[in-house]
């Protein structure tokens, strides 16, 4: 057992499975679940967690399932299947041959059908809005505070660059994050907003995705911001087609 | 804990050469990032590339730098850093280091080899 | 995005002050690093997280501030404080730009 075997793991992401057997003796992390190589320099997408989060046995997931406040998630967990570079597929089926197409964050944007369903390609999610309700405190936060503090969050713990956090909104207790990044703009390199926003809800529930790290301690000005409800919002760059039936 | 490059010397105008950082006392298959900086003489530091050495290989580039050096990392005892299409502007003294974070954006450099000197000229 | 380092040059004398400036050209909360560099050696690493002192680096060095504005002081001057330093970021290092300042040169009468 050496040194190197010590340091192969996966800061951001604990549910991988790392071992210094890739090129050169380099090491190498997987993603349970699926088995894909992941980098674990930046964030695992949002389709790998999710499936590595199914596989964990059920006993042992102390993982809660969104709560009836999750209003646009409204499927919440399932197994979704993802493309070789671990992005979500553009239709997702059951193990009932139950289909629905789904946008670049997992989300069901269609009805479900049957295997003869049709998702011609995967529709991005440019924009979201991250509402959140902060516990009582002593006064307001500042505004210009506060909207330092998540930039320095979103920048800092989940790699996302500052340009893609598009306004921080707040009136006491709401807190709005919006997050924008279209299609053009996405580098290679840069974080897709959707997996920071999906670390940013899991860390919030108190469901880290980061290796070792303690959760989240998020202060304005050494004042504690303690979350009480979250709710996503996503936008995508073609609009959902639902049928009227669901509408009403 | 020790970083040495090497691969330095002289080279003709619109060359190529290949610089290796490689080290001892502790292993490149880490959670860090390691960097190449150069130095033109009397000059300041200029970042080149970087490259993580965990698992993913993700690199980034200095904008002048890109499609003309590649960083890459084959095994987990060496950094390399190919450069073509040399200028005289290009003569500096070239140094690899360690990131002591495995997060990019909040690294700082813990760790230098002694440089190896690319001069540039015909 | 352009780390601004003033002044390029300053003289102190033996047992004096120097302060040395870093500005950022954006918000990089507290990450930024000082480097020690003496002709025909490589950068030392002085400070980091701002004003973190580094393992081994004497307290005479102090780094202070956050988000755009930095600084480097050096108490009780010694001879062989006559160096180069930098100051240094990676918060924008996916924009492709340098993150050095472009040095401050140290002279100690």
């Known amino acids: 057992h050496t040194a190197a075997q010590d340091n192969c793991t996966c800061p951001t992401n604990k549910m991988t499975v790392c071992s210094p057997d890739g090129p050169g003796g380099r090491c190498q992390c997987r993603a349970l679940g699926s088995g894909m190589a992941v980098d674990c320099s930046t964030l695992t997408s949002k389709c790998l967690l999710l499936k590595a989060r199914m596989s964990a046995p059920k006993n042992a997931r102390t993982l809660v399932r969104p709560s009836e406040h999750a209003l646009v998630d409204n499927d919440g967990l399932y197994d979704p299947d993802c493309d070789p570079e671990g992005r979500f597929k553009a239709r997702q089926c059951n193990q009932t041959s139950v289909c629905w197409c789904v946008n670049s964050v997992g989300v069901r944007r269609t009805d479900k059908g049957d295997l003869s369903l049709r998702c011609d390609e995967l529709v991005r999610t440019h924009h979201i809005l991250i509402d959140l309700r902060h516990r009582p405190t002593a006064g307001a936060f500042n505004h210009s505070d506060l909207d330092a503090e998540l930039r320095r969050l979103f920048r800092e713990r989940y790699r996302l660059h500052p340009k893609f956090v598009a306004a921080v909104h707040y009136e006491q207790p709401t807190i709005q994050i919006e997050l924008r990044q279209n299609t053009s703009q996405k580098a290679a390199g840069d974080v897709d907003i959707g997996d920071a926003a999906y670390y940013f809800e899991r860390d919030i529930k108190g469901e880290s995705l980061f290796q070792g790290r303690g959760g989240l301690d998020l202060r304005v000005r050494g004042e504690p911001l303690q979350v009480e409800r979250t709710l996503i919002y996503y936008l995508d760059e073609i609009p959902p087609k639902f049928s009227m039936k669901r509408l009403t | 804990q020790q970083l040495e490059e090497s691969g330095g010397g002289l080279v003709k105008p619109e060359g190529s050469l290949t610089l290796t950082c490689k080290g001892s006392g502790f292993d490149f298959s880490g959670t860090y990032w390691m960097w190449w900086v150069r130095q033109a003489p009397g000059k300041g530091l200029e970042w080149i590339a970087s490259i993580y050495v965990g698992s993913g290989s993700s690199t980034y580039y200095a904008s002048w730098a890109k499609g003309r050096f590649t960083i890459s990392s084959t095994s987990s005892t060496a950094v390399t850093l190919q450069a073509t299409s040399l200028t005289a502007a290009d003569t500096a003294t070239y140094f690899c280091a360690r990131g002591a974070t495995n997060n990019v954006f909040m690294n700082y450099f813990n760790l230098w080899g002694p440089g190896t000197l690319v001069t540039v000229s015909s | 995005f352009e780390m601004t380092q003033t002044p390029s040059s300053v003289s102190e004398p033996v047992g004096g002050t120097v302060t040395i400036k870093c500005q950022a050209s954006e918000d990089i909360s507290s990450n930024l690093g000082w480097y020690q560099q003496k002709p025909g050696q490589p950068p030392k690493l002085l400070i980091y997280?701002?004003?973190t002192l580094a393992s081994g680096v004497p307290s005479r060095f102090k780094g202070s501030g956050s988000g755009t504005e930095f600084t480097l002081t050096i108490s009780d001057l010694e001879a062989a404080d006559a160096a180069t330093y930098y100051c240094?970021?990676?918060?924008?290092?996916?924009?492709?730009?340098?993150?050095f300042g472009g040095g401050t040169e140290v002279v100690v009468k």
């Open positions: 997280g701002a004003s």
């Open positions: 240094q970021t990676s918060y924008y290092i996916d924009d492709g730009v340098n993150g």
